[in-house]
């Protein structure tokens, strides 16, 4: 003979794969204080329980160690704890109270557990700015993971030089010492939930601050094709009267501030151009000499100089009109 009672709360619960859920259950208020028995949680249509406090009863292999009956008759608690939820746990469950000494038992109403795909993703946090050559601790965290679940496995992927730091159930620390070439490269934290066989990851692009490593000047003279110089150059021949466009380019992140100077400037010299472009509309022989492009950056500066040698074609000058 069975007596029925209604589970309090919702008729269905949702949980994401790999995570935990508590199926609430309160023993019926009509239960006599003298009633003594065991509790069993069953999958609808199954006769082997998924969880029980009966030491003589086997539980389903699939749920062993993951489903637990939280049994506390004094507090009328008969809740079911599910950890490392799997897609196959998607089903309806009910609770049964049986006693060897009483002629009747209690059976609860059904409650559906819906197991959804894991949508949470790991978080990667970076304290402040990543600076070339300086170690920084990156933390990959899964704060939505429940403490009682099987601890996740963290793995990191990056081309930058790294070493593993401490970890907890919910986080892993990676020490990274980035180089200029690591700027804009990917770093991935992958988290695997072994209890459910689910893997999630997050990828970020590294933003590495670094001083300029290379500075170059592209030279556009008259209508001729541009050519590039990558190191200090002496006596670059230019044609008198022609337009000359000097385009300075440097790497560095954030971008270096580029400016042009006449000669070899002191640190506080006034530039002749506050950009990487220096236009000489009409080169004159009086202006041959040195020009310097300086790439200034909070982490260091770099400069490159070129020396103009102005020559002229005898037939080049304009005559009278």
């Amino acid at each position: 003979q069975e007596r029925r009672f209604q589970l309090e709360g919702p008729e269905s619960l949702t949980v994401q794969e790999g995570l935990c859920v508590l199926v609430p259950c309160r023993l019926p208020t009509t239960l006599p204080a003298s009633y003594y028995g065991y509790g069993y949680w069953f999958l609808e249509g199954a006769d082997v329980p998924v969880a029980t406090n009966d030491p003589d009863e086997e539980v389903q292999e699939e749920t062993r160690g993951r489903f637990h009956l939280l049994w506390d008759p004094r507090r009328k608690n008969c809740s079911l704890s599910i950890r490392d939820a799997r897609r196959r746990d998607n089903a309806a469950y009910f609770f049964r109270l049986k006693s060897k000494w009483m002629k009747y038992g209690y059976t609860s109403s059904k409650l559906s557990v819906r197991v959804m795909a894991l949508t949470h993703r790991p978080n990667i946090s970076i304290p402040g700015t990543l600076e070339s050559g300086h170690p920084s601790n990156l933390t990959c965290s899964v704060p939505w993971v429940c403490e009682q679940g099987t601890p996740p496995i963290f793995s990191w992927m990056s081309a930058a030089p790294t070493s593993l730091g401490p970890r907890t159930t919910q986080s892993s620390v990676l020490t990274i010492t980035p180089r200029p070439q690591d700027h804009s490269t990917n770093l991935t934290c992958q988290v695997t939930f072994p209890g459910a066989g689910v893997t999630m990851e997050r990828t970020i692009q590294l933003n590495v601050s670094y001083a300029p490593q290379k500075v170059a000047i592209s030279i556009f003279q008259g209508n001729s094709a541009a050519f590039k110089i990558l190191q200090n150059t002496s006596s670059l021949p230019v044609l008198e009267g022609q337009a000359l466009r000097l385009l300075c380019d440097a790497d560095g992140n954030p971008p270096a501030h580029l400016s042009w100077f006449q000669g070899f400037p002191a640190l506080n010299a006034t530039p002749i151009s506050n950009t990487g472009v220096l236009e000489l509309p009409q080169v004159g022989s009086a202006e041959e000499g040195d020009f310097t492009c300086r790439a200034q950056h909070p982490l260091g500066s770099l400069q490159i100089s070129l020396s103009l040698f102005v020559h002229w074609k005898p037939e080049g000058r304009a005559g009278g009109v």
Partner: antibody
């Protein structure tokens, strides 16, 4: 000291031609380009173009192609602006302005020549 | 063509004031901006080039700033001789264009 001295005011009829001069002194004439800038009465400044004083090659802004001509007399260190087939809307002050060595801005200006076109 | 917009046509001030003129480019011109002063009946005079470099002989109360599309000319301690029209000009790309100008007047 550097000076750009322009010719005096002009009063012309529509259809006529005017030639404005700009005499440069105090620097090497063929080292700096010469620009021309128009300022209509009560209006702002409009760049007309420039002439390379070394090669004599002129460059005109789109609005000043056709009736406008820049020329040089290098030996006299003088630049000229000629406007053909004058129209009423050519009434303005015209400035010659030396092109800076390190960019297309203007470091010295002539005093301006006022052109009035009226029938 | 790049349009240089000086939205204030007139500015009223008193001697000793700090005055700022703004100029907005319709596209990025880097730092290729010059500022000119034109007093009534005179030709323009170069004040600032490369957005922030003071031209030789220009008093240090004149300061230029900005890059990209937004530029400012500031007079930190306005003098009566500063009453004039002020024009910005971009020389980043052809054709080189001027702003419409701002007239500085006494209150």
């Amino acid at each position: 000291q550097i000076q750009l001295v322009q010719s005096g005011p002009e009063l012309k009829k529509p259809g006529e031609t005017v030639k404005i001069s700009c005499k440069a002194s105090g620097y090497t004439f063929t080292t700096y380009g010469m620009s021309w800038v128009k300022q209509a009465p009560g209006k702002g400044l409009k760049w007309m173009g420039w002439i390379n004083t070394y090669s004599g090659v002129p460059t005109y802004a789109d609005d000043f192609k056709g009736r406008f001509a820049f020329s040089l007399e290098t030996s006299a260190t003088t630049a000229y602006l000629q406007i053909n087939n004058l129209k009423n809307e050519d009434t303005a002050t015209y400035f010659c302005a030396r092109l800076a060595y390190f960019g297309y801005y203007f470091d010295f200006w002539g005093q301006g020549t006022t052109l009035t076109v009226s029938s | 063509d790049i349009v240089m917009t000086q939205s204030q046509k007139f500015m009223s001030t008193t001697v000793g004031d700090r005055v700022s003129f703004t100029c907005k480019a319709s596209q990025n011109v880097g730092s290729a901006v010059a500022w000119y002063q034109q007093k009534p009946g005179q030709s323009p005079k170069l004040l600032i080039y490369s957005a922030s470099n003071r031209y030789t002989g220009v008093p240090d109360r004149f300061t230029g700033s900005g890059s990209g599309t937004d530029f400012t000319l500031t007079i930190s301690n306005m003098q009566s001789e500063d009453l004039a029209d002020y024009f910005c000009q971009q020389y980043s790309s052809y054709p080189y264009t001027f702003g419409g100008g701002t007239k500085l007047e006494i209150k």
